[in-house]
Amino acid sequence: GITIPRNPGCPNSEDKNFPRTVMVNLNIHNRNTNTNPKRSSDYYNRSTSPWNLHRNEDPERYPSVIWEAKCRHLGCINADGNVDYHMNSVPIQQEILVLRREPPHCPNSFRLEKILVSVGCTCVTPIVHHVA
Amino acid sequence: GITIPRNPGCPNSEDKNFPRTVMVNLNIHNRNTNTNPKRSSDYYNRSTSPWNLHRNEDPERYPSVIWEAKCRHLGCINADGNVDYHMNSVPIQQEILVLRREPPHCPNSFRLEKILVSVGCTCVTPIVHHVA
């Protein structure tokens, strides 16, 4: 891997498991104020595999609000607006990092957590299940 | 909002900007060992709006590797396997949290950063722009 010289201005770490426990500045850089995905694009409605967005809230997590996509139909919407069951609407999932308060209810101590979220849906050709 | 009593076992914070700077345990909980999205599903190939996955690596970021989706076509794949330009392949984007080493090259000091990533693509009905 790439070896990067350590910056002499780095904070010291007294943690024996260094760098397992690190200092994190929560002043978010590159902040995008638009956190409601419904406002950022209307793809969820215009897609051939449309989805609904469900608000998932957890005060013990940062960010506390995550939007989860749920595909509206089993099939995909065709040119006539009907559901075509020769195709499948499927969720596109992504693993994201969140901060989980640990110990619980602590304002300044967290643990990194990976969670799988559904971001939207896409239309795919199905794998046909043949009867045994 | 919900008021949660502070856990008496929380670590103390000497940071004047508390809780702007927090302690984070990097031992990831709920770790999903399958980090290569190509292995987790073949939707990127089976979709009517297929996409390619590009590896974005940055040693100053955690996670250092992020996969970015790029739609293969402007249009969508129809039942005959041809590109239908009456429809559009568009990226589904999501804002995710990453940790950025700050000051640079420091192993145990980070700042939270929000970045916009393309997770996959979906097929949408285009917005037709009429000439005035």
Epitope: N52, R72, H73, Y85, H86, N88, V128, H129, V131 | -
Partner: antibody
């Protein structure tokens, strides 16, 4: 003409399973999805789920997730709905219905399932 | 899930009269609404789909209207065979749901 013929009435004990069949004729079976809807005596209609007769994939009402299975046999143009861990509240008439244009145009005659100890 | 509320619960009318049945959705369902008629001991029968399109063989005294959250089924002149229970159903998003029904009975 299009016809959906369902299997006969069933009496089951609580905790048991029931499998209802729906034989289609008069059209190409794999061209239309099949829905399952139930109706308790004197009550309204309740959507249970839908199966793509083409792929075999299904989507259920969350209320039944883990208890319902929907399958199909394309060679005999038949769809099946199996409900397990039966309870008295599952006593109802179960219908299969073909989907067309975001609606259910043809329905089976219904299968009465009685759950009683 | 999307909740469909039908009103009135019961409509008492005489043959020849006009029947107006309402169906309200808890959220916007565009025009993805169907109407069914059910008689005792029978399976439901499709009348209207896409909120306003009559199904094949349905008499033109049946008409549907509405979009978004408010939908109406109108029977312009009630015939004796029209006395039944009517259900609306949304096909906008799974789980697809039905209204509680409106019973049209002879006055």
């Amino acid at each position: 003409q299009v016809q959906l013929v369902q299997s006969g009435a069933e009496v089951k004990k609580p905790g048991a399973s029931v499998k209802v069949s729906c034989k289609a004729s008069g059209y190409t079976f794999t061209d239309y999805a099949m829905h399952w809807v139930r109706q308790a005596t004197g009550q309204g209609l309740e959507w249970m789920g839908v199966i793509s007769t083409y792929s075999g994939d299904a989507r259920f009402n969350q209320k039944f997730t883990g208890r319902v299975t929907m399958t199909r046999n394309t060679s005999i143009s038949t769809a099946y709905m199996e409900l397990s861990s039966l309870r008295s509240e599952d006593t109802a008439v179960y219908y299969c219905a073909r989907e067309v244009r975001r609606s259910m145009d043809y329905w089976g005659q219904g299968t009465t399932v009685t759950v009683s100890s | 899930e999307i909740v469909l509320t039908q009103s009135p619960g019961t409509l008492s009318l005489s043959p020849g009269e006009r029947a107006t049945l309402s169906c309200k959705a808890s959220q916007d369902v565009s025009t993805a609404v169907a109407w069914y008629q059910q008689k005792p001991g029978q399976a439901p029968r499709l009348l209207i789909y896409w909120a306003s399109t009559r199904h094949t063989g349905i008499p033109d005294r049946f008409s549907g209207s509405g979009s978004g959250t408010d939908f109406t089924l109108t029977i312009s002149r009630l015939e004796p065979e029209d006395f039944a229970v009517y259900y609306c159903q949304q096909h906008y998003s799974t789980p697809y749901t039905f209204g509680g029904g409106t019973k049209v009975e002879i006055k």
